[in-house]
């Protein structure tokens, strides 16, 4: 029986009975918050073989092993993960071993086993046999291995029953509990699963099988399950579902949800039955099961009950995330905030249409309205008193409306009003009149020419760059010396620069009046010699990276015909030179025969240019005689390998647990002080633990149903 869509067992251990007939849990399995220690020995679910998402265990008192509960759990697919993890065992106070002795495959995701004070048999499991990559596993804060004394079956009687593998250079027996070995398939099977008798399964099987080379005898499927058979792909007229099986159209149309209406049911897209159309797609009509590509961002209509939505904080803006059409009026009143421009863009940047009016007042934190980067239509179906549909009042730092060279905005009905925006040039307002089609609608008092732009350099001259030179991490630029009418009015220049992968940045990107700015700024004093052109060396840059640069002249706020003169350059895009790439990552080598090595690696994290080829070098090394000096069959600890200088026996040093061999010292000494990097790593580790714990608590603690 397939159970789902996710099972949450909490508070009462008797809820476990819900698992009685499950062979596959389609979704997650949570077992958590059972505070009263119970006897779980009578609970056994041998039918359960597969969990398609993840398994989460948290604070279950009295549970000592999972082996009795789930003796045949073979595969956790990790189709959806819990914070990147497919198996989470957290704060299980009485758990002594994991004991999932039939667990053979975690298809996706890592494991997190943390804060289980009594949990042993962790170092005896070779997770690399179960997961593709073990580097993201997080096994911390459990019972210290020294206190565990983990012994695999038969070790005490010197008749070891389990097989050995190497983990962290330690070759040892692999087992789940004191009487259960970790199953390994013969090397002849390669990546294939095997039966209990070590016969290789069909390639489409995953985890295990009841008969060899038979695609109908699999415990779980590598790809998809359909009509009793494991198949590499779903047959015609069937669709992938939940990452593991094939279903027909009727099945997909008959999946219900308490949250959505029946005309918002599951859809079929790209051969898959899924909950909703993927990003960039929309339903082909209100009662359709199929998706079509959106033209531009997919429409999402948002409506404000009270007609007017006040945006006075990031929190209130958050409610508009993803909205493309806003039915109602927007009142923007942002007096302060941290990183406000980019936060507002994140949450309001997709709005294309506002059906009512837009009012921006007392928004002293705003420098630009470019956070409304997709706004193209204000319908003005509802207007402010005086028939205004765009109203901008008392915004002390507002300098730019939008970048009118790249913006089409139409105001279908209603007038515009601008007053007391001291840094907003009137020319910017007039430009908006032309673009939006409102020219001629405004009366004389609607755009105040005296108190808009009174404290801004509204008549800007253009600064021209004269030369640019680049190296791998430096840019040198010079520009024409600016000569205002009175030379004494020129104070200095400010150079603004930032990384710009695309040539689409504007001066006001990410900038607000509270200190946030995505541009780096450097002040450049005037050269004392009036004939020398000003310039700057920008250093500490990244190789092979495109930067945007512009320069502004800093002038006295000298009023001339009620306006301040200023100067700035166009934005210049310039790329630094290529450099040597960083080292290739995750180099792995393995031998697949007596005369071959297979070497794999990932590209460098910093290519610093266009990578064209890799150089692989190798050399033969002499066999190390050290390998023969220790009896590897003894159960004694293998000595730590150190190329000693001949004065101290390594084994003696390692016998004293309180000391470490440190630096080039000739004897026991104190532990070396932690480096800054180590301290930083510890700090990040602690932070990461907190983030996960918060995520866990936020995910599982829910209000009790009324």
């Amino acid at each position: 029986e397939i159970c789902g869509p996710g099972i949450d067992i909490r508070n009462d251990y008797q809820q476990l009975k819900r698992l009685e007939n499950c062979t596959v849990i389609e979704g997650y399995l949570h077992i958590l918050l059972i505070s009263k220690a119970e006897d779980y020995r009578s609970y056994r679910f041998p039918k359960l073989t597969v969990i398609t998402e993840y398994l989460l265990l948290f604070r279950v008192a009295g549970l000592e092993s999972l082996g009795d509960l789930f003796p045949n759990l073979t595969v956790i697919r990790g189709w959806k993960l819990f914070y990147n993890y497919a198996l989470v065992i957290f704060e299980m106070t009485n758990l002594k071993d994991i004991g999932l002795y039939n667990l053979r495959n975690i298809t996706r995701g890592a494991i997190r086993i943390e804060k289980n004070a009594d949990l042993c048999y962790l170092s005896t499991v070779d997770w690399s046999l179960i997961l593709d990559a073990v580097s993201n596993n997080y096994i911390v804060g459990n019972k210290p291995p020294k206190e565990c004394g983990d012994l695999c079956p038969g070790t005490m009687e010197e008749k070891p029953m389990c097989e050995k593998t190497t983990i962290n250079n330690e070759y040892n027996y692999r087992c789940w509990t004191t009487n259960r070995c970790q199953k390994m398939c013969p090397s002849t099977c390669g990546k294939r699963a095997c039966t209990e008798n070590n016969e290789c399964c069909h390639p489409e099987c995953l985890g295990s099988c009841s008969a060899p080379d038979n695609d109908t005898a699999c415990v779980a499927c590598r790809h998809y399950y359909y009509a009793g058979v494991c198949v590499p792909a779903c047959p015609p007229n069937t669709y992938r579902f939940e990452g593991w099986r094939c279903v027909d159209r009727d099945f997909c149309a008959n999946i219900l949800s308490a949250e959505s209406s029946d005309s918002e049911g599951f859809v079929i897209h790209d051969g898959e039955c899924m909950q909703e159309c993927p990003s960039g797609f929309i339903r082909n009509g209100s009662q359709s099961m199929y998706c079509i590509p959106c033209e531009g961002p997919c429409p999402k209509v948002c409506e404000e009950e009270k007609k007017t939505k006040t945006i006075d904080s990031v929190t209130s803006a958050q409610m508009l995330q993803g909205c493309t059409i806003f039915k109602g009026n927007l009142l923007i009143n942002i007096r302060r905030g941290n990183n406000i421009a980019s936060e507002l863009e994140n949450f309001m940047g997709l709005i294309e249409v506002v059906t009512g009016y837009v009012k921006i007042r007392h928004s002293h934190a705003l420098v630009s309205l470019s956070f409304l980067k997709n706004l193209r239509l204000i319908l003005g179906e509802e207007q402010l008193e005086g028939n205004y549909s765009f109203y901008v009042l008392d915004n002390q730092n507002l300098q730019q409306l939008w970048d009118w060279d790249h913006r089409n905005l139409t105001i279908k009905a209603g007038k515009m009003y601008f007053a007391f925006n001291p840094k907003l040039c009137v020319s910017e307002i007039y430009r908006m009149e032309e673009v939006t089609g409102t020219k001629g609608r405004q009366s004389k008092g609607d755009i105040n020419t005296r108190n808009n732009g009174e404290r801004a350099s509204c008549e800007s001259d253009v600064l021209h760059f004269t030369s640019t030179t680049t190296s791998k991490n430096r840019i040198i630029i010079t520009w024409h010396r600016y000569r205002p009418p009175d030379y004494r009015d020129l104070i200095s220049f400010t150079v603004y620069y930032k990384e710009a992968p695309f040539k689409n940045v504007t001066e006001y990107d990410g900038q607000d009046a509270c200190g946030s700015n995505s541009w780096n700024m450097v002040d450049v004093d005037l050269p004392p010699n009036k004939d020398v052109e000003p310039g700057i060396l920008l250093h500490g840059l990244k190789p092979w990276t495109q930067y945007a640069v512009y320069v502004k002249a800093v002038t006295l706020t000298m009023v001339e015909n009620d306006h301040i003169r200023g100067a700035k350059s166009e934005i210049l895009y310039i790329r630094t030179n290529a450099s040597v790439p960083s080292i290739p990552l995750d180099v792995l080598s393995a031998s697949n025969s007596s005369s071959q090595l297979i070497v794999k690696w990932n590209p460098p994290s910093l290519p610093n240019g266009n990578l064209s080829y890799y150089i692989v070098r190798w050399q033969r090394q002499p066999q190390d005689g050290y390998l023969y000096r220790h009896n590897y069959c003894s159960k004694d600890k293998i000595p730590i390998r150190k190329y000693a200088d001949g004065t101290i026996d390594i084994e003696e040093v390692t016998e004293n647990p309180k000391t470490e061999v440190c630096g080039g010292e000739k004897g026991p000494c104190c532990a070396c002080p932690k480096t800054e990097a180590e301290k930083q790593a510890e700090k990040e580790e602690a932070e990461y633990r907190k983030v996960f714990e918060n995520f866990l608590h936020n995910s599982i603690f829910v209000p009790r149903p009324e």
Epitope: E1, A253, N254, L256, S261, S263, Q287
Partner: antibody, heavy 118, light 107 residues
């Protein structure tokens, strides 16, 4: 022919239990959500429960915690386990395959009578 | 839950006349409304699905209209076999709900 045949009704005392069955034929049972609807004597129709193709279950508030809907796709059968029965549960119970926007053909069982009385 | 209110409770009409039945939802349900006919001792029979979609085998004198919260079932010329109880049913959101029914009787 698409058909739903019901069984399991009868007389039961208050507080007692009863299990209704509904055998489906003529369509791919596992591919459809299945519902239970009841009708008290002389009253209107009342929707009580559904189980979808994934096995997700939903209930009307009036039966939540007392009734359990389940299905056995291998046997093409739908079940309604009714516990803690009350006098007000007396009704004709119908199993139904109610359509959705894509597949609108509604199919109903013949109905089975449940009488809760001491 | 979504409440469906049918009106009138009883409709007295002569054969051959037109009958108009109304169903109002307590909140918008799009077009996820269906109409059933039920005769004594029988299971309900679907007449109209999704507000206005007709079904094969159902006489074309039955038609449905409406969306959102207000819906109408119209029987253009009543035949003797049309005298029965009519129910509306919403499938927009769980739990599904039925209207209380409209009895169409011979005048």
């Amino acid at each position: 022919e698409v058909q739903l045949v019901q069984s399991g009704g009868g007389l039961v005392k208050p507080g007692g239990s009863l299990r209704l069955s509904c055998a489906a034929s003529g369509f791919t049972f596992s591919s459809f959500a299945m519902h239970w609807v009841r009708q008290a004597p002389g009253k209107g129709l009342e929707w009580i429960s559904v189980i979808d193709t994934r096995g997700a279950t939903y209930y009307a508030d009036s039966v939540k915690g007392r009734f359990t809907i389940s299905r056995d796709n291998a046997k093409n059968s739908l079940y309604l386990q009714m516990n803690s029965l009350r006098a007000e549960d007396t009704a004709v119970y119908y199993c139904a395959r109610l359509g959705n926007f894509y597949y609108g053909m509604h199919v109903w069982g013949q109905g089975t009578t449940v009488t809760v009385s001491s | 839950e979504i409440v469906l209110t049918q009106s009138p409770g009883t409709l007295s009409v002569s054969p051959g006349e037109r009958a108009t039945l109304s169903c109002r939802a307590s909140q918008s349900i799009g077009s996820s409304l269906h109409w059933y006919q039920q005769k004594p001792g029988q299971a309900p029979r679907l007449l109209i699905k999704y507000a206005s979609q007709s079904l094969s085998g159902i006489p074309d004198r039955f038609s449905g209209s409406g969306s959102g919260t207000d819906f109408t079932l119209t029987i253009s010329r009543l035949e003797p076999e049309d005298f029965a109880v009519y129910y509306c049913h919403q499938s927009s959101r769980l739990p599904h709900t039925f209207g209380q029914g409209t009895k169409v009787e011979i005048k």
